[in-house]
Interface confidence: low
Amino acid sequence: KELKVTQPEKSVSVAAGDSTVLNCTLTSLLPVGPIRWYRGVGPSRLLIYSFAGEYVPRIRNVSDTTKRNNMDFSIRISNVTPADAGIYYCVKFQKGSSEPDTEIQSGGGTEVYVLAKPSPPEVSGPADRGIPDQKVNFTCKSHGFSPRNITLKWFKDGQELHPLETTVNPSGKNVSYNISSTVRVVLNSMDVNSKVICEVAHITLDRSPLRGIANLSNFIRVSPTVKVTQQSPTSMNQVNLTCRAERFYPEDLQLIWLENGNVSRNDTPKNLTKNTDGTYNYTSLFLVNSSAHREDVVFTCQVKHDQQPAITRNHTVLGFAHSSDQGSMQTFPDNNATHNWN
């Protein structure tokens, strides 16, 4: 009977860590000589298994090749890794008396595709916080997957975003692959509670995509609106001033009251009010003793938010000498905000 080496499967797919069987059958036991498994072709091919009784980690023959009539030279590879990917050949040799064994026939080859799961996607954003209306880039990276086919999608609050660029490397054949994708997002003032999600779908994930999340609260700065108002006096010789910083994020806020340009009180906010959109409000009260001020006084509320230039709001209080009623003071807000760039 004519010798024929048959590898029935052109390819097999196996998840990393699992086992796979590479089938090989012969039609004849003649001529006498060994059967060997190789990965690859040509001079650089790698000997994988030779049925010579030696111990090879992770590889076993499927049938008992010591039996005289055995024609099944299939092997099982256990705990497969991406490095095991490649084309495996079952090769029949003829035993030489003095010269080396001669290769007489090879099977058609079986390609092993190792299915390796992608790593959980990591989403990175800009180093510095952006402001509403600014367009910022987020990058999603996942690595170590195989095969190369992979789907990556971006979402912001449930809405799909189209990436600027998505690349899978390397472009050629490799044991495993990496993906990198960049998306452009327009920040808006309501984004403190928003999330940008990178979703990776791959054959190894069984319809359960992996997600990487970037909370936009880590990448956005919403500057406060600052207002100074006068409250109704609590007694005849007191004026209550209120400085309100509204809708800011993050929490980092310093508030200073000044009288005629001199620091009067440092207010380190502790109890901030949180809005439903994730931003904060803060109100600082400043009690002015009118009897202590005969001249006009400019009270300034200076707000420094997240190491940004200070926002200032002025409020002028007319002195005791201007008042016809000795128990009251007149106040005039200065609506012009000045920005202190120091």
Epitope: I131, D133, Q134, K135, H162, L164, V186
Partner: antibody
Framework: QVQLQESGPGLVKPSQTLSLTCTVS??????????WSWIRQHPGKGLEWIGA???????YYNPSLKSRVTISVDTSKNQFSLKLSSVTAADTAVYYC???????????WGQGTTVTVSS | DIQMTQSPSSLSASVGDRVTITCQAS??????LNWYQQKPGKAPKLLIY???NLATGVPSRFSGSGSGTDFTFTISSLQPEDIATYYC?????????FGGGTKVEIK
Amino acid sequence: QVQLQESGPGLVKPSQTLSLTCTVSGGSISSGGYYWSWIRQHPGKGLEWIGAIYYSGPIYYNPSLKSRVTISVDTSKNQFSLKLSSVTAADTAVYYCAREGYHSGMDVWGQGTTVTVSS
Amino acid sequence: DIQMTQSPSSLSASVGDRVTITCQASQDISNYLNWYQQKPGKAPKLLIYDASNLATGVPSRFSGSGSGTDFTFTISSLQPEDIATYYCQQFAYLPWTFGGGTKVEIK
């Protein structure tokens, strides 16, 4: 409504730097929501996107020109600019500036300015 | 870069005819495609954005369709003022790229 106007020399010598400015009127360049782009068109040919800038910083360039292109913005003058270094005759073209909406195309264009590279 | 292939490169049609231009992207660009009209000596004008949305002030005889790699631009009834070159442009992947253009003439 927003209008764009390109300005700059119509003739540039080879190896020199081409400099163009686009002035935005009828709206603020820093109001957000738009990219400000440069596009060119070689004589009798199609359109080539050069690059775009957002008022607060991000800039994108066409890789084929990236080594020679600089796009910048001056919000105080409501202008954005293009510089193309080491020009050759192949850079002779009509240069357009345009406003690009986030997902709504280049909806406002300047009338274009012809730049000839010749000694 | 994404290659945008427009066809035909030129066409001649009669007033009132239906005119169709196609644009093919070298890979999937979803619906991230715009169409522009350029008359001689003038700047391009946006007609269609996001493959099928009519830009403000553009007559309803212009329309666009398609998604993925194949797109179509249609003038339902050609008018004399429609004599121009039409370009498709993708904005799915940097750099933005344009088709080679289709010159439309009246017979």
